[in-house]
């Protein structure tokens, strides 16, 4: 093996080009200068190296930059990025959105890998918050990105960034995440008029409190059943039959099909049967006439 450490005569690479695909791994190691590789990283992307050869090229860069690659190299990693481990990426300082886009492009069409998750984490932490341009970029590549964040992480999203969020970006968010996002959305869209406001806020309503739902019921919004079913149960329960009727408008008929599912089921149990009957939908399970309803939570608060 000793003789293989020296580059054979005439094989020293003067530039990064297609001829290198014919080099054995030990020849790449011996004949490609790491500094040359770093300055011509953009060429690697256009050369069909084997994965084994890419391992050698990565090793050379690792030796040249033991503390982590500079951004000038990172931006041109191309598909060599797929060879990086999360540990490698944690050494990087990525500040340019263009660099982030270039690397996300390499992983496009695939699930978010641990490498990509680490890259995004490094980038966002470096910026201090999820600004609109970053959020735009991330949700374009990964529509489920927002819902992968913890409520704590979501708290760093400024209300101005909410404008970048599309309804599909929230599809997999749970109530705890929507609890954080809803107040930001309410703030972001506060200057819009009624119908426009509802179109924008609709996707976030899974985090809305009762008082906001009551306010919406006064605005003829005609909420669809899919949105209603995603509302917080605790926010829906205090709504009266009249308020729900106003909130849903013509979609109120859909309650019948959902009467066994939350939050409709739990809401029905809290309404007087007399009131439910006024809807003419045949909803059953309300409080029978003549029964007294004690609100125990109120009693506890008084004592």
């Amino acid at each position: 093996e000793v003789e293989k450490t020296a580059c054979p005569s005439g094989k020293k690479a003067r530039e990064i080009d297609e001829s290198l695909i014919f080099y054995k791994k030990w020849e790449l190691e011996a004949c490609v200068d790491a500094a040359l590789l770093a300055t011509q990283m953009d060429r690697v992307n256009a050369i069909p190296f084997t994965y084994e050869q890419l391992d050698v090229l990565k090793h050379k860069l690792d030796e040249l930059y033991p503390q982590g690659y500079p951004e000038s190299v990172i931006q041109h990693l191309g598909y060599l990025f797929l060879k990086m481990s999360p540990e490698d990426i944690r050494k990087w300082n990525v500040t340019s959105l263009e660099t982030l886009k270039a690397l996300l492009e390499v992983n496009k069409g695939h699930e978010m890998s641990p490498q990509v998750a680490t890259l995004i984490d490094r980038f966002v932490k470096g910026r201090g918050q999820l600004d609109k341009d970053t959020l735009d970029t991330l949700t374009a590549f990964y529509p489920g990105y927002l819902c992968s964040l913890s409520p704590e992480e979501l708290s760093s999203v400024p209300p101005s960034s909410i404008w970048a969020v599309r309804p599909q970006d929230l599809d997999t968010c749970d109530p705890r995440q929507l609890d954080v996002l809803y107040p930001k959305a309410r703030l972001a869209f506060q200057n819009m008029n009624g119908s426009e406001y509802f179109v924008k806020i609709q996707s976030f309503l899974g985090g809305a409190p009762t008082e906001d739902l009551k306010a919406l019921s006064q605005q003829n919004v005609s909420m669809d059943l899919a949105t209603f079913m995603k509302l917080r149960t605790d926010a829906v329960l205090p709504l009266t039959v009249a308020e729900v009727q106003k909130l849903l408008g013509p979609h109120v008929e859909g309650l019948k099909a959902e009467e066994r599912h939350r939050p409709v089921r739990d809401w029905i149990l809290r309404q007087r049967q007399d009131d439910l009957d006024t809807l003419g939908l045949g909803l059953q399970g309300g409080i029978p006439n003549g029964y007294l309803v004690l609100d125990l939570s109120m009693q506890e608060a008084l004592s």
Epitope: E18, N45, A46, I47, P48, F49, Y79, L82, E105
Partner: nanobody, 113 residues
Framework: LQLVESGGGLVQPGGSLRLSCAAS????????IGWFRQAPGKEREGVSS????????NYADSVKGRFTVSRDNAKQTVYLQMNSLKPEDTAVYSC????????WGQGTLVTVS
């Protein structure tokens, strides 16, 4: 999105074969293509490469003068014409595309015996 190789088979020494590498689900036009081979127990090695335009081709010393690489972008296919085949050319041949993304084919077996 994949590359599919075909054209492999059993051939006698001195014979010829033409391998094809076709793109499925993406367009080959913007990609440089490399042909590689791997014999049992050996390191995978580069055989030839062709630029995205087809204007630049390269060959490993061991196949120069015997193999020719070409491409037909209209058919989204790259070819490897292999003449004067030798027993040491026996291997699984696969193609790879590079140019922003990377695609590898599953390979096609060439046996010279």
């Amino acid at each position: 999105l994949q590359l599919v190789e075909s054209g492999g088979g059993l051939v006698q020494p001195g014979g010829s074969l033409r391998l094809s590498c076709a793109a499925s689900g993406f367009t080959l036009d913007n990609y440089a293509i490399g042909w590689f081979r791997q014999a049992p127990g050996k390191e995978r090695e580069g055989v030839s490469s062709i630029s995205s335009s087809g204007g630049s081709t390269n060959y490993a010393d061991s196949v120069k003068g015997r193999f020719t690489v070409s491409r037909d972008n209209a058919k989204q296919t790259v070819y490897l014409q292999m003449n004067s085949l030798k027993p040491e050319d026996t291997a699984v041949y696969s193609c790879a595309a590079a140019g922003g993304f990377r695609y590898w084919g599953q390979g096609t077996l060439v046996t010279v015996s």
